[in-house]
């Protein structure tokens, strides 16, 4: 179903963005890129 494909794709994109910020902070010490509290 196309909705499911879109949801999976967005979820994967969202995870990759979050992981990029995480890696920058924990393996790159780029603290300015930390995720702020909601």
């Amino acid at each position: 179903h196309s909705d499911g494909i879109f949801t999976d794709s967005y979820s994967r994109y969202r995870k990759q963005m979050a992981v990029k910020k995480y890696l920058a902070a924990v393996l790159g010490k780029r603290y300015k890129q930390r995720v702020k509290n909601k």
């Epitope: 990029k20 910020k21 995480y22 890696l23 924990v26 393996l27 790159g28 995720v35 509290n37």
Partner: antibody
Framework: QSVEESGGRLVTPGTPLTLTCTVS????????MTWVRQAPGKGLEWIGF?????DAYYASWAKGRFTISKTSTTVDLKITSPTTEDTATYFC??????WGQGTLVTVSS | AAVLTQTPSPVSAAVGGTVTINCQSS???????LAWFQQKPGQPPKLLIY???KLESGVPSRFSGSGSGTQFTLTISDLQCDDAATYYC??????????FGGGTEVVVK
């Protein structure tokens, strides 16, 4: 600043188990918290992390097998349905530069 | 998912000597976010190097990291008895998070 894991024990396969990481002097609104495990005599295995906003992300092999959540001073790792392959020392780390001593989980029937 | 392969293991050298550990990734490490950890028996890992070549605060300058892309190296010069440990590389993988190498044991003669 310190990190300490607790909750590790002997459990039978399929019995859910929650490990707790208690932090002191660390603002969980400013750091990522990571869970890593190490089977006896083996290497390190990254499980996942939780961000400042409380969103958790997992290695693909760990998704569905583990759940990471947090309060203001603790970070929990729930092993949803342990198998013998989950026998390991579980480490919690602030970012990846401040680690606890780990807590041992043994899964056996 | 990236697979990190460490060579050689174990590696042995005399006090005052130099040890080189290689870490090869099956795919390019995201952002060159490659770290090196030291782990002694019964202890948690300790961060030595981050972003391939940057020395963590408090770590002796005898430890150095280099490399980019898929090939990385940890060099320990003026080897000390206290350096006897297992060393792990850990690389950034945007689909998986963090991938650890299998570890390299350093034996000091």
């Amino acid at each position: 600043q310190s990190v300490e894991e607790s909750g590790g024990r002997l459990v039978t396969p399929g019995t859910p188990l929650t490990l707790t990481c208690t932090v002191s002097g660390i603002d969980l609104n400013s750091y990522y918290m990571t869970w890593v495990r190490q089977a006896p005599g083996k290497g390190l295995e990254w499980i996942g992390f939780i961000d400042a906003g409380g969103d958790a992300y997992y290695a693909s092999w760990a998704k569905g097998r583990f759940t990471i959540s947090k309060t203001s001073t603790t970070v929990d790792l729930k092993i949803t349905s342990p198998t013998t392959e989950d026998t390991a020392t579980y480490f919690c780390a602030r970012d990846l530069d401040l680690w606890g001593q780990g807590t041992l989980v043994t899964v056996s029937s | 998912a990236a697979v990190l392969t460490q060579t050689p293991s174990p590696v042995s050298a005399a006090v005052g000597g130099t040890v080189t550990i290689n870490c090869q990734s099956s795919e390019s490490v995201y952002g060159n976010y490659l770290a090196w950890f030291q782990q002694k028996p019964g202890q948690p890992p300790k961060l030595l190097i981050y972003e391939a070549s940057k020395l963590e605060s408090g770590v002796p300058s005898r430890f150095s990291g280099s490399g980019s892309g898929t090939q990385f190296t940890l060099t320990i010069s003026d080897l000390q008895c206290d350096d006897a440990a297992t060393y792990y590389c850990a690389g950034g993988d945007i689909s998986e998070g963090v991938a650890f190498g299998g570890g390299t044991e350093v034996v000091v003669k």
